[in-house]
Amino acid sequence: HHHHHHASQPCPYPMAPPNGHLSPVQAKYILKDSFSIFCEPGYELLQGHLPLKSFAAVCQKDGSWDQPMPSCSIVDCGPPDDLPSGRVEYITGPEVTTYKAVIQYSCEETFYTMKVNDGKYVCEADGFWTSSKGERSPPVCEPVCGLSARTTGGRIYGGQKAKPGDFPWQVLILGGSTAAGALLYDNWVLTAAHAIYEQKHDASSLDIRLGALKRLSPHYTQAWAEAVFIHEGYTHDAGFDNDIALIKLNNKVVINSNITPICLPRKEAESFMRTDDIGTASGWGLTQRGLLARNLMYVDIPIVDHQKCTAAYEKPPYSGGSVTANMLCAGLESGGKDSCRGDAGGALVFLDNETQRWFVGGIVSWGSMNCGEAGQYGVYTKVINYIPWIKNIISNF
């Protein structure tokens, strides 16, 4: 007695899609047989617009496949991300974003420079724009620092009027008393802890102005603080050690000839900050007339030997130990040139002769009761001691 089993109907012979291949290849496919589709490199499995990592179809008892054939479509990396303060150029062809296409990122000339890589990206088989170093995220256009209209570090209190673009990193800080700061990158301000201590829990009350020349001018770029970071080693009303703070701005500022960040000192910077090397302080602080300056002023002053400065501040009314290793002093022994009240937090800058860029060596911190006094000097926070602190905060916030 024989049972006649009807042979199940074979499924239609599958045809691999263009740029794909089928496995396993069989003479015919019957019930429960299956096949998978694999795409060539640079092509991806898609069912319409929906991506698939793998595809397998099974032959059903009615002789039909349980799902339709997918396509192997060329990988499309899509439009590349915009580059703030830069642009992207399609190298392979206009708007071509498919596998092996090449694009070139570049930064706005003069004021921005490319960080991370050379800006050339290729659309890879995984669907991501990728640099030659393997980075998937776009490059960064970092503001060029230390550019100034002032070309010499030659010949405030006893100072001269600044011209547009001379001190483009200069920041005016209002909200408590008048203070200053210096722009770092495009969204940070370096200043003195004592200058903004009262606002440390109320960052939004700080009125921050960039690109200004005249203190009361309506022509400036407004910025607001997102957060204030005061050095944890600074103690208010107990000397000026660690008198350094950072303000994070709530938006990046647009860099131009009147708003440019100051550079942080390189390791080699100390060679440009030896005794008698000239630094430049700028600000709207008290002038010889005893009033806040209307115009941004600057003064070129030499660095003073640390021991000489320490000794100058050991006599009453000062207490011994006022000048620490975290400070540097600048000024003339004869007096007459100094920073003063209202300049606090501003940068004492130096020209790096190798890079021809200006960098911040000091932050206006404290000094004699009478600015520009003979035998007394302006005391500045020694920025090079705080590079790890600055970099740690900027990278973490």
């Epitope: 319409g48 617009h49 793998s54 179809a57």
Partner: antibody, heavy 118, light 105 residues
């Protein structure tokens, strides 16, 4: 069984950002398929917002491209929606869903209602 | 791509055969899915690739069409089928139809 669960604030103020999380259980979001955000407005109109694929690539509805971001955390098997500069027009029920034909099946979360109001 | 479901409402009786239609503004091949949604619930997938039924979906639901014209047919309407039906194209990005509500006569 594959399950998707949306979470996030039910009330957002105009001009702020809307942030939602979709937690997936029963299947790894890196294994396959597209992981989508879809919203349904009052009146039942459905709108696809975008997806993040198994490989981490994204595709967005062109009408939302300037203010949408879909990201993921593979260690938590979650994917996220951020919609910036919301207005009252963004009031809707937001669904996360795994869309895919054949063996892929279709799985949707139960939806979370978001109201944009001051 | 716009998916047009021209009938907002369709009246039917239990046991009837009803066809819900969807028209694409351009060719979408067979990259169309159909969904059923009941009040207070998430959409439930019925059909993918225009004519393939998801497992667990009763065989009274059939899908057909390709290119621009698509139909979901319910051959023997049951009371639990009274719901809103949406089509979805996934050929170029994804767009849903505006929905067709199936109600009792």
């Amino acid at each position: 069984d594959v399950q998707l669960q949306e979470s996030g604030p039910g009330l957002v103020k105009p001009s702020q950002s809307l942030s939602l999380t979709c937690t997936v259980t029963g299947y790894s979001i890196t294994s396959d398929y597209a992981w989508n955000w879809i919203r349904q407005f009052p009146g039942n109109k459905l709108e696809w917002m975008g997806y993040i694929s198994y490989s981490g690539r994204t595709s967005y509805n062109p009408s939302l491209k300037s203010r949408i971001s879909i990201t993921r955390d593979t260690s938590k098997n979650q994917f996220f929606l951020q919609l910036n500069s919301v207005t009252t027009e963004d009031t809707a029920t937001y669904y996360c869903a795994k869309l895919g034909g054949g063996h892929g099946m279709d799985y949707w979360g139960q939806g979370t209602s978001v109201t944009v109001s001051s | 791509i716009v998916m047009t479901q021209s009938q907002k409402f369709m009246s039917t009786s239990v046991g009837d055969r009803v066809s819900v239609t969807c028209k694409a503004s351009q060719n979408v091949d067979t990259n169309v899915a159909w969904y059923q949604q009941k009040p207070g619930q998430s959409p439930k997938a019925l059909i993918y690739s225009a004519s393939y039924r998801y497992s667990g979906v009763p065989d009274r639901f059939t899908g057909s069409g390709s290119g621009t014209d698509f139909t979901l047919t319910i051959s023997n309407v049951q009371s639990e089928d009274l719901a809103e039906y949406f089509c979805l194209q996934y050929n170029s990005y994804l767009t849903f139809g505006s929905g067709t509500k199936l109600e009792l006569k």
